[in-house]
Amino acid sequence: VQNSCDNCQPGTFCRKYNPVCKSCPPSTFSSIGGQPNCNICRVCAGYFRFKKFCSSTHNAECECIEGFHCLGPQCTRCEKDCRPGQELTKQGCKTCSLGTFNDQNGTGVCRPWTNCSLDGRSVLKTGTTEKDVVCGPPVVSFSPSTTISVTPEGGPGGHSLQVL
């Protein structure tokens, strides 16, 4: 004979010795019907705040308050947001490795410094874990056939450099 607890809906509990579906008491939930007990609702307070409230059929979901981020499955811990020069990993905030940077507060990943030489430019300012490299103007390499003429432009004292 099928136990009548099997017909119980989520949001209820049922004991085998008295197979009657009963509503979960306040601050408890059951996402599966027919269980002998309802689960105690999660509470989101302190560094946590509610992303979802607990109902009779689902648990509360928490997130971290501003300036903090979640760690662990279902946001079990809150950790202070990463500073510029760091990135968030599974182990928490880690300093950017040499040659990478992150200029964002709380978010973002460490990105490689710009390679100035790819654009034919020199490094004007070296990068840090928080700031990218600053590239200088393009390096003009003069070949033997290059001629330079300075021509007046736009009135007295105005000159422009023309690379021919």
Epitope: S27, V43, A45, R49, K51, F53, C54
Partner: antibody
Framework: QVQLKCAGPGLVQPTQTLSLTCTVS????????VHWIRQPPGKGLEWMGI????????YFLSAIKSRLSISRDTSKSQVFLKINSLQTDDTAMYYC???????WGQGVMVTVSS | DIVLTQSPTTIAASPGEKVTITCRAS?????MYWYQQKSGASPKLWIY???KLASGVPNRFSGSGSGTSYSLAINTMETEDAATYYC?????????FGSGTKLEIK
Amino acid sequence: QVQLKCAGPGLVQPTQTLSLTCTVSGFSLTSDGVHWIRQPPGKGLEWMGIIYYDGGTDYFLSAIKSRLSISRDTSKSQVFLKINSLQTDDTAMYYCARIHFDYWGQGVMVTVSS
Amino acid sequence: DIVLTQSPTTIAASPGEKVTITCRASSSVSYMYWYQQKSGASPKLWIYDTSKLASGVPNRFSGSGSGTSYSLAINTMETEDAATYYCQQWSSTPLTFGSGTKLEIK
């Protein structure tokens, strides 16, 4: 900055459907839920329900639940409240609020009368 | 549903006086939340997580309690504190409010 603006008709006839809109700015509906709360004239606050960041909803488990629906349009940053088969005791100030109740709309007064 | 019973319904206090409003829950809740509402205005979150003051709330206000018994206190009443105060629980839906306490100036 965070703002919620409620809009809807001031006067609705009994048995008709009430449609209210809450337009939010300063936060995303895909990150934060929005509540609807109402307050009959001279009375207390009654929580009606919430639409969550993922579109899921929770409603007040009372007689009104069967007449109530909350939905949203994330592209327009709007949350909607619909109540059908309106009764005179649905006359109230209707508010929307962000999930943490830290920001509330200015409210819209709805009178149900023929 | 968790029923919240506030007392008193109305209270009149003179400036400088200490005021206490209580909120009793029909079953245990983890934290209590309080709102202030002035006539013709939207409610404002006043106290959260039982005892934390919301942004801009003067520190003459305090909140305390646990289980089924909670309270909001004003150390020294000021005229601007005249308003209606509501308690609310977030432990489980439906989220319920107390019926309100109207605080008037004597």
